[in-house]
């Protein structure tokens, strides 16, 4: 009788579809992820199964708590789609599909500087390029550890460019750039490039 009741409940909204989610939706190859399959009904003993496309990855029983499936994303096909099934006795419902976005991390960018020196000013052009990593890549330029540009998004493998004009300074300035894509908490920085102070013939980046 209980199985019949459960099945009848499923035909109403008393037993809705489970929800499949992960805290990390954007991942890089080799990353470990946890997938959570949960259900609104906290009183039933539910069997959760996880699938990717048409392969079965695992089964767990749960009551009140989400089932946690731990996976390692090592191949492109492991991005998904995933779905989970919640089953009570002979009745089951499926979640919506869930897919990860696999992103290659950015490599350390290279910063190039070009300077046009006038009597009073320096016209500085900064170029920053990360040769590896999934696009788009956001570049930010820094002077003495302070951001001097907005994030510049590049959807192609071309350097980001930022121009600035400075009064001929009396002290050294250090420039670097940051490259970041959709991978959360993963940014890389170029080696710093130091611009010497003015005085004498000390402008190694200047166009004469």
């Amino acid at each position: 009788r209980k199985a019949v009741l459960d099945c009848e409940a499923m035909k109403t909204n008393e037993f809705p579809s489970p929800c499949l989610d992960s805290k990390t939706k954007v991942v890089m190859k080799g990353q470990n992820v946890s997938m959570f399959c949960s259900h609104k009904n906290k009183s039933l003993q539910i069997t959760y199964s996880l699938f990717r496309r048409k392969t079965h990855l695992g089964t767990q029983d749960g009551k009140g708590e989400p089932a946690i499936f731990n996976l390692s994303i090592t191949e492109a096909h492991e991005s998904g789609p995933y779905k989970c099934k919640a089953q009570v006795t002979s009745c089951s419902k499926y979640s919506r599909d869930f897919s990860f976005t696999i992103v290659d991390p950015v490599t350390s960018p290279v910063l190039n500087i070009m300077v046009i020196q006038t009597e009073t000013d320096r016209h500085i052009t900064l170029h920053c390029l990360s040769v590896n990593g999934s696009l788009p890549i956001n570049y930010t330029f820094f002077e003495n550890h302070v951001a001097i540009s907005p994030a510049i998004s590049k959807y192609d493998r071309e350097p980001a460019e930022f121009n600035l004009t400075k009064k001929n300074p009396g002290e050294e300035e250090e420039y670097r750039c940051e490259a970041k894509n959709r991978l959360p908490n993963y940014a890389t920085y170029s080696h710093p490039v130091t611009m010497p102070s003015t005085g004498g013939d000390s402008c190694p980046f200047c166009l004469k």
């Epitope: 990717r52 496309r53 392969t55 079965h56 695992g58």
Partner: antibody
Framework: EVQLVESGGGLVQPGGSLRLSCAAS????????ITWVRQAPGKCLEWIGT???????YYSTWAKGRFTISRDNSKNTVYLQMNSLRAEDTAVYYC?????????????WGQGTLVTVSS | IQMTQSPSSLSARVGDRVTITCQSS????????LSWYQQKPGKAPKLLIY???RLASGVPSRFSGSGSGTQFTLTISSLQPEDFATYYC????????????FGCGTKVTVL
């Protein structure tokens, strides 16, 4: 070249045991699923069981308990251990590879190995 | 789980349109976890159709598949001499564990 080669078949007495091997080349068992299928002389194809890329195993109702599938990743080989063999287990045994993430779309097959259970 | 294939055998001529059906006692996983195979005597089966209707690599376009849930069809639009063989369907299920089942085959012979 992607291929599967079965071995280990032969004549065995009723009640005996046999271990079949399925050697994979050209691909890794850590990515693909391997399924064992058998065919008695003049009869239908019959699903025995499957081992997926994660090492999870699945069996048909009749095979559970008597047949065991395992794998050795270092040898890139899958095994079918068959115990308590009966005359009705006489068949050609095939191993087959599924598509990535599709256990039972069997696109690569071995040549088969004949198992005869007779006294 | 029962996978019933019909007819069990049929005779046809070259150029004929041939239809084979597979009826499952319950729905396959995702409503389309079904594949079709061709087998010739003494040979291993060959994958023809997957996802119920998608043509496997290298399979001639005269083969097609259709259906969903519990009822599936394999059609050969114009039978060729090399098509005389036995055809099997294979369904994947998740109702009582992760499970597969073959139909018992349809033998296509020359009329």
């Amino acid at each position: 070249e992607v291929q599967l080669v079965e071995s280990g078949g032969g004549l065995v007495q009723p009640g005996g045991s046999l271990r079949l091997s399925c050697a994979a080349s050209g691909f890794s068992l850590t990515i693909y699923t391997i399924t064992w299928v058998r065919q008695a002389p003049g009869k239908c194809l019959e699903w025995i069981g499957t081992i997926n890329s994660y090492g999870n195993t699945y069996y048909s109702t009749w095979a559970k308990g008597r047949f065991t599938i395992s794998r050795d990743n270092s040898k890139n080989t899958v095994y079918l251990q068959m115990n308590s063999l009966r005359a009705e287990d006489t068949a050609v045994y095939y191993c087959a590879r599924g598509y990535v993430d599709s256990d039972w779309y069997l696109n690569i097959w071995g040549q088969g190995t004949l198992v005869t259970v007779s006294s | 789980i029962q996978m019933t294939q019909s007819p069990s055998s049929l005779s046809a001529r070259v150029g004929d349109r041939v239809t084979i059906t597979c009826q499952s006692s319950e729905s396959v996983y995702d409503n389309n976890y079904l594949s079709w195979y061709q087998q010739k005597p003494g040979k291993a089966p060959k994958l023809l159709i997957y996802d119920a209707s998608r043509l496997a690599s290298g399979v001639p376009s005269r083969f097609s598949g259709s259906g969903s849930g519990t009822q599936f069809t394999l059609t050969i639009s114009s039978l060729q001499p090399e098509d005389f063989a036995t055809y099997y369907c294979l369904g994947g299920y998740d109702s009582s564990g992760w499970y597969a089942a073959f139909g018992c085959g349809t033998k296509v012979t020359v009329l």
